[in-house]
């Protein structure tokens, strides 16, 4: 949320859109006449990356000078200034900062506590005054039975044989975000949530280790949902619907085991958890949870540097990384991403000033803060400049947590980036086994949806900007994230080949940047959404009979999907027929491509009430998965199915898809209006 200072002091994003060549980067004597080709650029990038010591930078960013660096703290700010200075040293076209005043939640001087009490509320004993906390928890005291709900997924709650209403729920960390666990528990009228790391999933020797997280089912400052708090907008006080109304607290494994000692019932064997795990507190005992966290307003800084494009400076790819971290552990969470951001910025600055690389489009390097509170810095920037970013920012590349292991290369992205990612995976070799990252022609089916706790999520789901996040990681979660053990030493112990792994991540990101800013035709595969739409229609088709019973038809949805398919085919034909050297024509065609993601944002919901408007990847009743979930209820439990809602969902989903098809078609006279 942003407070606007005097105008002359405020650097607006729009300034990055100027084309004044005097502001572009200084270059040494480099041949400017010949355009570098993809093969040359790839080799150039690879050579540049070979000469960089990534691990040293990560180590430097993980040391006491910059830790701990909670958002808005002095050390967070000093790192921000360091990054800003680095960007200046790289002689970027423009370097600027974005200042926001956001509400974050911190621990109070009064300790949070977990206590076992008897049925009369009398103290049996103190289990723990936890060292960690969960930001945006409700500050409250609750007492009740404790029920284990595994990871706290919707299915986990469905599989329980005991209701959780009026009870405190204990869940394992992992699988889904803290916020989702809490939202699932709250939806079933649980009164509080405890989260712990079991030894099976998080093999940490220290059972007393505390950890941090946040419980906002959303991103950005939850007290300015869907909008930035510019002081002249005069929005009344507001509160995100994603904030929990129940207290939530992280506890150590040792505390969880103390609780299990007062509990009964075997945890199911298919949970594959610790043998100490138990299901419910004994009938004579209750658990009392007290959370007394407090809200604080903090000034936060996002730092930006731009390399302006030489042909289309008003079109930009954004590359970003989280700078902050809750607690003392910073290495895997934010030092890797920030180090990578700095080194990529240096490499690209170098390629332009020394080697003649001339990106057509601009590259914005962004250092976000308050990421640990739910991508606050990134979201506030998006909220503040939503209209400026539309049809300008065309891809976001997230560098957070890119190296957590070596075994797997995992991708989460907009379908528009699948084809490009596939090509890059074929090009880039894994540093350990020397084989290409492309292991499986079926890799797209393994792509995981971007989650709420990923900074790429608001780009895609809130702003409709194609986004990608990737990581080298293990099947198991990296155990130290959110703990004080997230140190450089722990990371190098887990990933001995850290330097090579980060270098490879840099190669993936670097190739993405080059392909997206260099090629005349925008490397976004709009045809990928055909299979997404087909998959949705197939899922819906299973319920043909139900839809017919309601007197509804899928004909219009088929028609909208068909129009989208025809529009993509027509655009492909147009690209094929276009003269690649005709910049004007190519820009018009690329603009049509840039509309695709944005037009999957439902125009029928308010960004304030439902900020994540994307019908595929967003959150809320307007999404296609929500439509299917609602329809499923008709078969399972007629009482829970909402027919009025479904009728709306189907009509609006159909028209959103039709709108996306129309936008892709181009001009209004090109649109097939038989609909």
């Amino acid at each position: 949320c942003k407070r606007v200072e005097q105008k002359e002091e405020c650097v607006k994003l729009a300034e990055t859109e100027e084309t004044d060549k005097s502001e572009t980067m200084e270059t040494e004597d480099v041949p400017t006449s010949s355009r570098l080709y993809w093969a040359d650029l790839k080799t150039l990038l690879s050579e540049k990356l070979n000469s960089i010591e990534f691990a040293d930078t990560i180590k430097q960013l993980s040391q006491n000078t910059y830790t701990p660096r909670e958002a808005g703290s002095q050390k967070d700010e000093s790192l921000a200034y360091y990054i800003e200075n680095q960007f200046h040293e790289f002689k970027f076209s423009k370097v600027w900062r974005d200042e926001h005043y956001v509400k974050i939640q911190v621990k109070d001087s009064a300790q949070n506590s977990v206590i076992i009490v008897d049925k009369n509320g009398r103290l049996v004993y103190l289990v723990e005054n936890p060292g960690g906390y969960v930001a945006y928890s409700k500050a409250a005291t609750v007492t009740g039975k404790l029920v284990h709900a595994n990871f706290g997924t919707k299915k986990d709650f469905e599989d329980l044989y005991t209701p959780v209403n009026g009870s405190i729920v204990i869940v394992r960390a992992g699988k889904i975000t803290f916020a989702e666990k809490v939202a699932n528990a709250e939806s079933l009228n649980a009164i509080g949530v405890l989260i712990y790391m079991d030894q099976t999933k998080f093999p940490i020797v220290n059972a007393e280790l505390s950890f941090f997280g946040h419980a906002h089912l959303g991103t950005g400052d939850p007290y300015t949902p869907g909008f930035p708090s510019f002081n002249h907008t005069q929005f009344p006080p507001s509160r995100s619907s994603g904030l929990p109304n129940i207290p939530v607290q992280t506890i150590s494994r040792a505390a969880a085991e103390k609780l299990f000692g007062n509990m009964e019932g075997d945890c199911p064997s298919d949970w594959k958890t610790d043998s100490t795990c138990r299901m419910v507190t004994s009938e004579s005992k209750n658990v009392k949870l007290t959370v007394s966290n407090v809200l604080k307003e903090r000034r936060i800084l996002n730092i930006f540097g731009v390399i302006k494009g030489y042909e289309e400076p008003d079109r930009y790819v954004v590359v970003g990384a989280q700078r902050d971290a809750l607690g003392a552990g910073v290495a895997a969470k934010s030092s890797v991403g920030t180090g990578l951001l700095l080194k990529l910025a240096q490499v690209f600055s170098d390629m332009i000033s020394k080697d003649g690389f001339r990106p057509s489009r601009s590259i914005i390097f962004a250092s976000w803060t308050a990421g640990d509170f739910g991508a606050v810095g990134a979201t506030e920037w998006l909220e503040g400049y939503l209209s400026s970013l539309h049809l300008k920012a065309f891809t976001y590349i997230n560098l957070d947590k890119v190296v957590l292991g070596t075994s797997n290369f995992k991708v989460s992205a907009s379908p528009l980036l699948y084809t490009l990612m596939g090509k890059i995976m074929q090009d880039v070799k894994h540093p350990v086994d020397g084989k290409s990252l492309y292991r499986d022609s079926n890799w797209i089916s393994k792509v995981e949806k971007l989650s709420f706790d990923n900074a790429a999520y608001p780009f895609l789901a809130y702003s409709g900007i194609p986004a990608v996040s990737f990581c080298f990681c293990e099947d198991a979660d990296y155990p130290y994230l959110g703990t004080r053990l997230d140190t450089y030493e722990a990371l190098t112990q887990k990933v001995p080949q850290l330097n090579q792994m980060v270098r490879t991540a840099a190669e993936v990101a670097g190739q993405l940047i080059i392909k997206l800013t260099h090629d005349v035709e925008l490397n976004l595969d709009y045809e990928r959404y055909n299979s997404q739409l087909l998959s949705f229609v197939r899922d819906l088709n299973q319920y043909r009979a139900d839809i017919k019973e309601m007197g509804l038809s899928l004909q219009w949805l088929y028609s909208a999907r068909g129009d989208f398919f025809r529009a993509t085919s027509r655009l492909t034909t147009d690209f094929g027929n276009a003269e690649k050297t005709d910049r004007f024509v190519m820009k018009k065609l690329n603009d049509r491509v840039m509309r695709v993601e944005y037009h999957f944002l439902s125009p029928y919901v308010s960004p304030k009430e439902s900020p994540f408007r994307h019908v595929f990847w967003g959150s809320g009743s307007h999404t296609l998965p929500a439509l299917l979930e609602n329809l499923k209820l008709r078969k399972q439990n007629n009482g829970a199915f909402n027919e009025t809602l479904f009728r709306n969902q189907l009509a609006l989903a159909t028209w959103t898809i039709q709108g996306a098809a129309n936008a892709l078609s181009g001009d209004v006279w090109d649109i097939d209006n038989e609909f």
Epitope: K119, E264, G265, D266, P268, M279, V280, E283, S284
Partner: antibody, heavy 122, light 109 residues
Amino acid sequence: EVQLVESGGGLVQPGGSLSLSCAASGFSFKGYSMSWVRQAPGKGLEWVSSLSNGGGSSYYADSVKGRFTISRDNSKNTLYLQMNSLRAEDTAVYYCAKTLGAYYIKSAMDVWGQGTTVTVSS
Amino acid sequence: EIVLTQSPGTLSLSPGERATLSCRASQSVSSSYLAWYQQKPGQAPRLLIYGASSRATGIPDRFSGSGSGTDFTLTISRLEPEDFAVYYCQQYGSSPPWTFGQGTKVEIK
């Protein structure tokens, strides 16, 4: 309808063995602890053994410890009681019972079978 | 082990009368862990009260439980013909064994 049906009772000589089964239906068997309770002819109820929902924790009355083994097969919704080294004082009607609350082992028993008779006599 | 002693052994009453059955424990029992059962000849026991005072599903409100520590009571406010049976108390809160009282027979006077 929640139902428990015991089987396997009969006449056995002292020192002999017998295996009782209890088939459960109408509820989520794997979520509940189960118990065996017996009643000697003309006498009161005697708790024999209890087993937690996943089979991880078992408890026995002193009078049967080391001779009886309680077990369950959650995939078959069946509870078992393996009785070895039987004595004349083990003669009784054996009831299988379900705990009231899911997961609780320390719980009242809200559903009972009709019982199966075990007679130990030479 | 906790020994539960029920009194009286037999209670002779007429339909419509109030029945008060007592269960005394040899050591303190958490009220969360005391139950009462009814058993009729040739039938399995039936849960009436759990947690000392909570009525099980489908149990008429003429049955009520009370007490704490070592003294617990089952009260039948107005005896109906179908209430004549043997009543057992059970504790299930301590470490095993989980014991039953010897029973109180409520018979028609």
